[in-house]
Interface confidence: low
Amino acid sequence: ESLGTEQRVVGRAAEVPGPEPGQQEQLVFGSGDAVELSCPPPGGGPMGPTVWVKDGTGLVPSERVLVGPQRLQVLNASHEDSGAYSCRQRLTQRVLCHFSVRVTDAPSSGDDEDGEDEAEDTGVDTGAPYWTRPERMDKKLLAVPAANTVRFRCPAAGNPTPSISWLKNGREFRGEHRIGGIKLRHQQWSLVMESVVPSDRGNYTCVVENKFGSIRQTYTLDVLERSPHRPILQAGLPANQTAVLGSDVEFHCKVYSDAQPHIQWLKHVEVNGSKVGPDGTPYVTVLKTAGANTTDKELEVLSLHNVTFEDAGEYTCLAGNSIGFSHHSAWLVVLPAEEELVEADEAGSVYAG
């Protein structure tokens, strides 16, 4: 399924390179960000026609949703844009790239929209540098989990256009100073560090200057080492359900896991009148499990169509990662169809709820 799961805090209009096939990138954007997902052809070869899918449904291009063969842009993202995105080969439906996108209220790492902070002619004849978005620079302390992407911004202007340089703990900071390097985007007044590690902790200072003056801002970065844990399942899910014979039922299971989780849906069964085997393990049948082209999002829902009385019983959502397993169970009760109830009532039978 994949080579690893990475959680990133990415900035506005940050282009995210496509993961290895089967790998699921977990991406966090701020509300209002431009979500830009990139899925280059594997091995650099021709990819053929592709389709972008969100939560299992094909995306329709619009003024806000820009769809290209290898790139997807969602402008002015909101909570509704959170979900599981994938780029698939149109003919085979093979998943080329998966992305799990979460849109949060907070702007990502004090970022701003692409291009908004580019150098501008202010109309002032001459002038020392000044911050163009000081309200975006309030967050002086940034604490992020290891493996996230961090972006510091110091949007500024001046005339002549000032230069920007970066210091770490008071010393000049260059790409060769860290494994993985850094990205300096002068047009956006930004410093980007991907996949941060504990050694990236420290004070980062942007120095913006021209011949009329100099201004600086210091940010403190703390990198939190994740304490690995087995998957966490959202309380109350799946929920017990009561359904009428022949109706459709959905069980939901929300899984939170740093390490890539494997999700299975199980139905408890009896074997020779026993619910558990000789080792105390419950007898179950696996209804749904990870396939090569099944997204985690799809696995978080178990759909039962046209239920029969045999479908009644206990269902379990089982999620496991390299640390351990968690599971929640729920019961399905199947009631006779209403007309059957009426007929039964007329016959004098009583149904106990």
């Epitope: 690893g4 074997v271 085997g277 007898y283 179950v284 049948t285 696996v286 209804l287 396939g291 397993f325």
Partner: antibody, heavy 126, light 111 residues
């Protein structure tokens, strides 16, 4: 005793398809996952995917996605593996292998191939 | 496509002990105790020799034993016999590819 008997050797041209069968006996066919593993001449073992004979559910290795189809016929306790768009590098011995964990098993991770078919040689040549 | 690394060949004299290693990563061998070993004689189907790192199926000689340290699993054959000459494959559950095999090790029992 448990036995998995596979169909005979096949010679195919590039671009064609091949369908290999695996007849199970000596146990309840629908109670155990059936996997397919192949071995090119002089090479190692390569897992292709599994089928749950109880539900018909499948899981294919990424490499074979779109080219392989695994099916079963519970009435005759037989699993099938069909590989399409054959190329010369598909020349191999194809094995069906029963995994020790049953379709009732709690965890699917503990995959142990306790019984194997005798293998079917598929030769792809123009 | 080989995810687990095994030595291409090992050899030993009758009565000796040999060890075959199988190196993976934390997402396969190192992450789970689901390592199996298979023996394959020429022209035959593989046979399960060890499962869950160190357990032997019934009928397998106690000369075969398995262990694991970190990301490396090992198969040890003690009191080597001529009939032990075969190819040996390790197999592990893998977090991302589901099932992975090693490239195989040819065991030669000398003269």
């Amino acid at each position: 005793q448990v036995q998995l008997v596979q169909s005979g050797a096949e010679v195919k041209k590039p671009g064609a398809s091949v369908k290999v069968s695996c007849k199970a006996s000596g146990y309840t066919f629908t109670s155990y996952y059936m996997h397919w593993v192949r071995q090119a001449p002089g090479q190692g073992l390569e897992w292709m995917g599994w089928i749950n004979p109880n539900s018909g559910g499948t899981n294919y290795a990424q490499k074979f996605q779109g080219r392989v189809t695994m099916t079963r016929d519970t009435s005759i306790s037989t699993a099938y593996m069909e590989l399409s768009s054959l190329r010369s590098e598909d020349t191999a011995v194809y094995y069906c292998a029963r995994s020790m964990n049953s379709t009732m098993y709690w965890y699917l991770r503990r995959v142990l191939f306790d019984h194997w078919g005798q293998g079917t040689l598929v030769t792809v040549s123009s | 496509d080989i995810a687990l690394t095994q030595p291409a060949s090992v050899s030993g004299s009758p009565g000796q002990s040999i060890t075959i290693s199988c190196t993976g990563t934390s997402s396969d061998v190192g992450g789970y105790n689901y390592v199996s070993w298979y023996q394959q004689h020429p022209g035959k189907a593989p046979k399960l020799m060890i499962y869950d790192v160190s357990n032997r199926p019934s009928g397998v000689s106690n000369r075969f034993s398995g262990s694991k340290s970190g990301n490396t699993a090992s198969l040890t054959i003690s009191g080597l016999q001529a009939e032990d000459e075969a190819d040996y494959y390790c197999q592990s559950y893998d977090m991302y590819n589901y099932i992975v095999f090693g490239g195989g090790t040819k065991l030669t029992v000398l003269g």
